[in-house]
Amino acid sequence: QRLSRAQQQLPLESLGWDIAELQLNHTGPQQDPRLYWQGGPALGRSFLHGPELDKGQLRIRRDGIYMVHIQVTLAICSSTSTSRHHHPTTLAVGICSPASRSISLLRLSFHQGCTIASQRLTPLARGDTLCTNLTGTLLPSRNTDETFFGVQWVRP
Amino acid sequence: QRLSRAQQQLPLESLGWDIAELQLNHTGPQQDPRLYWQGGPALGRSFLHGPELDKGQLRIRRDGIYMVHIQVTLAICSSTSTSRHHHPTTLAVGICSPASRSISLLRLSFHQGCTIASQRLTPLARGDTLCTNLTGTLLPSRNTDETFFGVQWVRP
Amino acid sequence: QRLSRAQQQLPLESLGWDIAELQLNHTGPQQDPRLYWQGGPALGRSFLHGPELDKGQLRIRRDGIYMVHIQVTLAICSSTSTSRHHHPTTLAVGICSPASRSISLLRLSFHQGCTIASQRLTPLARGDTLCTNLTGTLLPSRNTDETFFGVQWVRP
């Protein structure tokens, strides 16, 4: 993927500084495994510059390769909770719409830990909506230094 | 956040390539939970290009959104050490000065593991000093491939 | 490290957009602890833009500071597998050739977990080949959302 001559002449801002860092707003209703996110300076240190939120889900507005990262910490958790005393807890980040592009991008199980954290590079297209599905019966922490989700445009 | 016309005309270097990757130097004295870092080519593969070290703590010299990442591995550790025989071990990365901007940015507990690793996007300002506080009674590894801390400027 | 005047005049593409995200192809033969990677749109969401693969190992083609990231999930794994019933499982990412630059960049043990994920900034040079060595007797998952390895050029 090369930049066109036109792109090379444009100011840097138009090449894509799209970036977002979100904090957990709430979990979904009973049959909805999705986490619902929020962002904005009024909320603390979360922000959206380019991407947008659609009912708590992150929607991409610029094509490109993105670094996607996430950390989720389970609330009131011990290694006992996650391993033996509760249903296995898994976090999956994926494109959930449009349906034609639905795919799991990143998946982690908590096993005997109470936090998962990872990151990956992935191509995303304008209109892709990312969902973060938490299965299991343990509640995620809403502390902003324990649970967060973000994307960063890195290349056309 | 848009680049000003003046910024658009400046050479790329002035837009901010600030970046640092540090290795563990030592832990603090008894009542000081902070980890003390060091960086520079003479030490191996660590470096500072822009940010600086102030008594082992990382100080930011350019405003912007940064990707902050860290990995800490506990020395002489087994899952037994972290779960049953010691005070819970937690790592927190935060702005510790100026006091008016003090906040926890990233927090992880070791639970039954011996390594934590995570990353997040966060706005930082010139003069912010980042501290990495390790609570608990287990010593962190000084191996440069096991324990490291870094920041990367990604956007104004 | 400053950009030369010549570099400042070059189109942005020549400053380095080098980036790759790989998926697991296969493990090595008996005495070879290396993981063998593959990438390309035909395989899914993996890609190489700049770096190249040499017999399943990632080779760098442009000098610079890179963000290296990896996630490896063990297949058919439980916390019991990784802790008590198997040889300790460890993942190390390093420069394996040229031999003169051989070094371990990133090392993680699975302990009682089934996934490791981390990232770090490191200087890499044209011709450096990165190897990912998995020790232990547990097989890594080939699911593309569970096991992946990538690099991103971030600065000259």
């Epitope: 957990l24 979990t27 209703p29 009973q30 910490t73 609330a75 009131i76 033996r84 005393h85 509760h86 249903h87 296995p88 019966t137 343990l138 509640l139 922490s141 809403r142 502390n143 324990e146 | - | -």
Partner: antibody
């Protein structure tokens, strides 16, 4: 529809044991922990413990730890709560309960089983 | 164990009037961005019914005249306009740690 159906009332003598069953339906049995809560006549509610049907592991209120055992039979989606060394103050309605999404609060309850301990 | 203290023990309120029940925990039940306090309604001969979870979330199917508030150690259940079918005993419960404990109950009657 989630349902929790408990076994019938029991009368026991002091020192004996009682085993109350709770059959769950309407959801995947091995997903949600099942808790036991008791209520003495005219009194409040008391949490006794819970069991995770996926593994059979249980957590007990320290007050009952030496006398209570919770087990499960995944083939019939049934959990059991056995209380031993019964005393008159164990006379109560025993409820099983589970949750709808996250653990910690109880959206679904059994109808209750009255256990009377009397000589 | 965390001790839950409800007040008042009983409450008589006119139909259509507001009823307020308080619950105090012996130490904070708030952590990780939540308050682990839940409220139940129990009518004679029936099991308890969940009304409010995590301090202020209305359980599905519960009339919106019920609301919860509070954080830390002090919590309130409010019935904004008492109806005849609201006559019952109300319990608070925490799930901050094991063992979970309940308040002693508040009996609500019509004046």
């Amino acid at each position: 529809e989630v349902q929790m159906v408990q076994s019938g009332a029991e009368v026991k003598k002091p020192g004996a044991s009682v085993k109350v069953s709770c059959k769950a339906s309407g959801y995947t049995f091995t997903t949600y922990n099942i808790h036991w809560v008791r209520q003495a006549p005219g009194q409040g509610l008391e949490w006794m413990g819970d069991i995770y049907p996926g593994t059979g592991d249980a957590s007990y209120n320290q007050k009952f730890r030496d006398r209570v055992t919770m087990t499960r039979d995944t083939s019939t989606s049934t959990v059991y709560m056995e209380l031993s060394s019964l005393r008159s103050e164990d006379t109560a309605v025993y409820y099983c309960a589970t949750f709808s999404r996250f653990d910690g609060w109880f959206a679904y309850w059994g109808q209750g089983t009255l256990v009377t301990v009397s000589s | 164990d965390i001790v839950m203290t409800q007040s008042p023990d009983s409450l008589a309120v006119s139909l259509g009037e507001r009823a307020t029940i308080n619950c105090r925990a012996s130490r904070s039940v708030s952590t990780s961005g939540y308050s682990y306090m839940h409220w139940y309604q129990q009518k004679p001969g029936q099991p308890p019914k969940l009304l409010i979870y995590l301090a202020d979330n209305l359980e599905s199917g519960v009339p919106d005249r019920f609301s919860g508030s509070g954080s830390g150690t002090d919590f309130t259940l409010t019935i904004s306009s008492l109806q005849a079918e609201d006559v019952a005993v109300y319990y608070c419960q925490h799930s901050r740690e094991l063992p979970y404990t309940f308040g002693g109950g508040t009996k609500v009657e019509i004046k």
